[in-house]
């Protein structure tokens, strides 16, 4: 018997319908937000529906359009910049990715005070990186690994860098493994606050191993893709960090910034660069073995034309019980006074707080403290800190803005957020004008999300930027499946747990479960946001609750549940899985025979490992793009967490928790494998060497592979990959198509 | 006080090799990027070569590029040009300059290289 | 390359008069790379100008420069007896740098 969510029969349920695939597939239920586009202390820029770009001045209600949609279509621009002497825009078109954070594109200066495109000395094509200074309207750009400055935009560039080469030097812009894994970002250069000087990284990968993969394409013969990419243990990249003037760049040329005498004596990284004035810059390193990071303080020596970084002013944050920060190194806020500074960094309980630097580390002052985590610091003004945690209600899964009076002693903290739209709102991000004399509140939910704006002294809201009426109209004759999150309390540990459970769900019926696994260090699964998905249709047209649950390693919740990991990866990510699982079925409803797991990426590797435990909980799974062993993913990421693969480091917990190494174990479960070929972060590597290993183990197996496609399986691809997913997972839980 | 002292030059044949210092005092010498500039007898002003303050990076004309090598000592203060292969063409008197590509603020008094069989 | 015509090749002109040197660039140069030099007979070069206009330190006031794009002035408002060179124009916007042929300019 095939037990089903029942049927209501009252007129007003007769006319709701349950999620399709098709709805999920099309984006029917995808909601917008707004993040205005400051340009001061009182105005944005926002592309309105018809793209036209408009500025909006709050205090005197006016906007007007800077810049027509016939202009933006006379190029096919689909990004804009504004010049901050507003004289000048750039467009951006011919868009085309990179990796995750990168792309190239094609750029257009348009010229608003003569309402023409600059004509004469145009930039080359395609542009890497492009941006305006902070002051007036110089530009900086990135064409084939070299960096080059532009005094006006009719003006002929000025290249800084020559040594600039694919795949061997990249300067302005990382390479793979620092846009991944440590920046985040497509660039890698920065401009001081008044656009004096500018500050660029140089990324050496030379002697970097190259990943090589096929890109099958249309061709005749197939592309090969290579990328210098390090894994584990393998050679990394070297970097240098200089500065230019870019008044006169020709006459000194870039002048280097040194690097910490005890960060330089082993292999380093860069992990991020912070002005703090035109002449004072911050720069943070870390060690390779990432439990050591030094904030670096350094200032324009004008009689020298050098940049000075004394050892005063280096202050090192160290983690004796895991990895320094939380998945990157946090970075400063500095205040007024251009020298002390506010971080968040774990207090002694280890919760991560904000504290502020005056003189020392040692001697900081803790701003928050609490067993809750400060998660964002927005904004520092004279009188106001403004950041986001996760204290209200101690739900480590929501996320409210806070405000703490630092003009006044002893300060005074007000949550901004908290009551604002309780149930709807429990989950915020906040984007501020200069001074913060203006900012916008985007909540993600629980409820449809919700875009407003208010004012910086007083908090109050001026109007709604966005709120998804459209959406809003569109699901009230959808039944969406009922959400709630829980926790479990587990030999001392806490497992917060979503579970999303039919429309019509009956705690007397039982349900097929799917386990919704990532579970990587210092993620958050479960959290309070607004998602019409995948997992929502599989509740509510095809009866099955689903569970997310945050296990060790995940963040938010201090430093013991986050480190718990440290050196041991899929291993407590997995027993947590299985420990909630295990509490799922006492709760009576679930169906036992009927239990699956499914992840990507870091999910995957769980996933697997949860399906060869040997428990016999789960009946089938699937992996997407999933990691099968620590040795072939990056070496920033892997060795954060788990240092290096050597015989005198921890190269025996590498071999031991490998998917291959329990191949016999997934005989008794129904495996679904599935991986882009095209994969330039988790390499198609890992899922050959997990399939190698069933073959020899004569174990059967279910995949399929995504030629061409990389780690994100986009376009076509993800419709096939959901429909191809929901049909194993029908079929598993013997549910009729 | 800036000052730039310039040596090494003298007669060469052709094919063969010569080494150029020059002195630079009154200033961080390896903060800033150097040149040399030279002058052929009777003739205008030619860039030859320049590197970074750290001596990482280097530059050459193409007329001298595959002969010529510029290195500096920053803990002698001291910036080199390596001549080899020299052509009649490369008589000149030969300028140390203090900057990158432009402006060169100060100059040595420069040395003077003659190639001649 | 970037070449720099500088023209006229010599100017004769008597101490007091005023003087105009012109620089025009084969493609356009942004002006704070551009540079005026003065050198005398056995004298190495010395800087006048960078930046277009910008006078190098200890420089009188009487040296000026303009221009901007491929047109470039260096301008003498009343020569002195000291001022008789040979005046190079240099652009560093593009690699390799590159001087002018120099104008001379000598007594009448």
């Known amino acids: 018997i095939v037990l089903r969510p029942s049927r209501v029969h009252n007129s007003e349920e007769n006319t709701m319908r349950a999620l399709t695939l098709k709805d999920i597939l099309n984006g029917t239920f995808s909601y917008k937000t707004f993040f205005p586009n400051w340009i001061s202390g009182q105005e944005y820029l926002h592309q309105s529906a018809d793209n036209n770009i408009v500025l909006y001045n709050i205090e005197t209600g006016q906007s007007y359009t800077i810049l027509s949609n016939r202009t933006m279509k006379s190029v096919n621009a689909s990004n804009y910049g504004l010049s901050p002497d507003r004289q000048f825009v750039y467009l951006e078109s011919d868009y085309s990715k990179l990796w995750r954070y990168s792309y190239t594109a094609t750029y257009y200066i348009y010229d608003l005070s003569n309402g023409e495109f600059v004509r004469g000395n145009e930039l080359p094509r395609p542009i890497q990186y492009l941006c305006w200074s902070p002051v007036g309207s110089k530009l900086a750009y990135v064409y084939q690994n070299n960096i080059y400055l532009k005094q006006r935009p009719g003006d002929p560039p000025f290249q800084i860098t020559f040594n600039g080469r694919e795949n061997k030097i990249f300067n302005g812009i990382p390479d793979w493994v620092y846009e991944e894994e440590m920046l985040a970002t497509k660039y890698a250069l920065w401009w001081s606050p008044n656009g004096k000087f500018l500050a660029y990284a140089e990324f050496n990968d030379t002697d970097i191993p190259v990943i090589a993969y096929s890109y099958y394409g249309d061709e005749q013969y197939p592309r090969t893709i290579n990328i210098p990419y390090p894994k584990a243990g393998a050679k990394n990249p070297v970097v240098r960090i200089f500065i230019i003037d870019t008044t006169y760049p020709a006459y000194v040329g870039p002048q280097e910034v040194p690097v910490p005498a005890m960060i330089a004596s082993s292999d380093y990284y860069f992990s991020w660069l912070t002005w703090v004035t035109d002449e004072r810059v911050c720069l943070q390193w870390l060690k390779r073995v990432q439990n050591v990071s030094v904030l670096s303080i350094c200032d324009f020596r004008e009689d020298w034309q050098t940049w000075d970084c004394p050892k005063t002013q280096e202050h090192i944050e160290e983690s004796r019980t895991g990895w320094a920060g939380g998945f990157f190194v946090s970075t400063p806020v500095f205040s007024y006074d251009a020298i002390s500074y506010y971080k968040i960094f774990s207090d002694k309980d280890g919760y991560k707080h904000i504290h502020y630097i005056k003189d020392t580390v040692e001697n900081a002052i803790q701003i928050t403290s609490g067993k809750w985590e400060a998660i964002n610091i927005f904004r520092v003004t004279q009188d106001s800190l403004f950041y986001s945690s996760n204290e209200f209600e101690e739900y480590p899964g929501r996320r409210n803005i806070y405000r703490i009076s630092i003009g006044s002693y002893p300060p005074s903290k007000k949550c901004v957020t908290c009551h604002l739209r309780k149930e709807r709102c429990q989950y915020y991000t906040a984007s501020f004008s200069d001074y913060a004399k203006y900012y916008a509140l985007v909540c993600y939910g629980p409820g449809i999300p919700i875009s407003t704006l208010h004012d910086g002294r007083t908090d109050q809201e001026i109007k709604i930027l966005e709120e998804n009426k459209e959406l809003e109209n569109a699901l009230k004759n959808i039944q969406l499946p009922k959400e709630e999150i829980k926790k479990l309390e587990v030999d001392e540990i806490t497992l917060w747990y979503k579970m999303i459970l039919p429309p019509q769900f009956d705690r007397s019926k039982k349900y097929p479960l799917l386990i919704q696994v990532y579970g990587g260090p210092c993620s958050q699964s479960v959290r309070s946001v607004f998602a019409v998905n995948w997992i929502s249709y599989l509740a509510s047209k095809e009866g099955m609750v689903i569970a997310l649950v945050d296990g060790r390693g995940t963040a938010f919740q201090g430093d013991k549940l986050l480190y718990a990991v440290y050196r041991k990866l899929g291993v407590y990510e997995v027993e947590d899985q299985i420990t909630a699982v295990r509490k799922f079925i006492e709760m009576g409803f679930i169906d036992e025979k009927r239990i699956a797991i499914w992840g990507w990426s870091y999910g995957g590797y769980v996933s697997s490992l949860a399906l060869a435990s040997g428990t016999g909980l789960f009946k089938c799974g699937i992996a997407v793009a999933p990691v099968s062993s620590w040795e072939y993913y990056a070496s920033v990421y892997t060795e954060r967490f788990m240092g290096l693969p050597t015989k005198d480091d921890n190269l025996e917990h590498y071999k031991n928790s490998t998917v291959m190494a329990r191949a016999e174990y997934f005989r008794n479960v129904d495996y679904l494998l599935i991986h882009g070929t095209a994969d330039d972060n988790v390499h198609f590597q890992n899922s050959a060497q997990i399939a190698k290993a069933l073959v020899n183990a004569q174990v059967d197996f279910q995949a399929m592979w995504y030629s061409d496609q990389n780690h994100g399986l986009s376009g076509l691809s993800t419709n096939h990959l959901y429909t191809h997913m929901t049909h194993f997972l029908k079929q598993c839980f013997s549910l009729s198509d | 006080e800036v000052q730039l002292l310039e040596s090494g030059g003298g007669l060469v044949q052709p094919g063969g090799s010569l080494r150029l210092s020059c002195a630079a005092s009154?200033?961080?010498?390896?903060?800033?990027?150097m040149s040399w500039v030279r002058q052929a007898p009777g003739k205008g002003l030619e860039w030859v070569s320049a590197?970074?303050?750290?001596?990482?990076?280097?530059y050459y004309a193409d007329s001298v590029k595959g002969r010529f090598t510029i290195s500096r000592d920053n803990s002698k203060n001291t910036l080199y040009l390596q001549m080899n292969s020299l052509r009649a063409e490369d008589t000149a008197v030969y300028y140390c300059a203090k900057g990158w590509f432009t402006p060169f603020d100060y100059w040595g008094q420069g040395t003077l290289v003659t190639v001649s069989s | 390359e970037i070449v720099l015509t500088q023209s006229p090749g010599t100017l004769s002109l008597s101490p007091g008069e005023r003087a105009t040197l012109s620089c025009r660039a084969s493609q356009s140069v942004s002006s704070n790379y551009l540079a005026w030099y003065q050198q005398k007979p056995g004298q190495a070069p010395r800087l006048l100008i960078y930046?277009?206009?910008i006078r190098a330190t200890g420089i009188p006031d009487r040296f000026s420069g303009s221009g901007s794009g491929t047109d470039f002035t260096l301008t003498i408002s009343r020569l002195e007896p000291e001022d008789f060179a040979v005046y190079y124009c240099?652009?560093?916007?593009?690699?390799?740098?590159?001087f002018g042929q120099g104008t001379k300019v000598e007594i009448k």
């Open positions: 240099q652009q560093g916007n593009q690699i390799p740098p590159t």
């Open positions: 930046g277009a206009s």
């Open positions: 009154g200033f961080t010498f390896s903060s800033y990027a």
């Open positions: 590197i970074s303050g750290s001596g990482g990076s280097t």
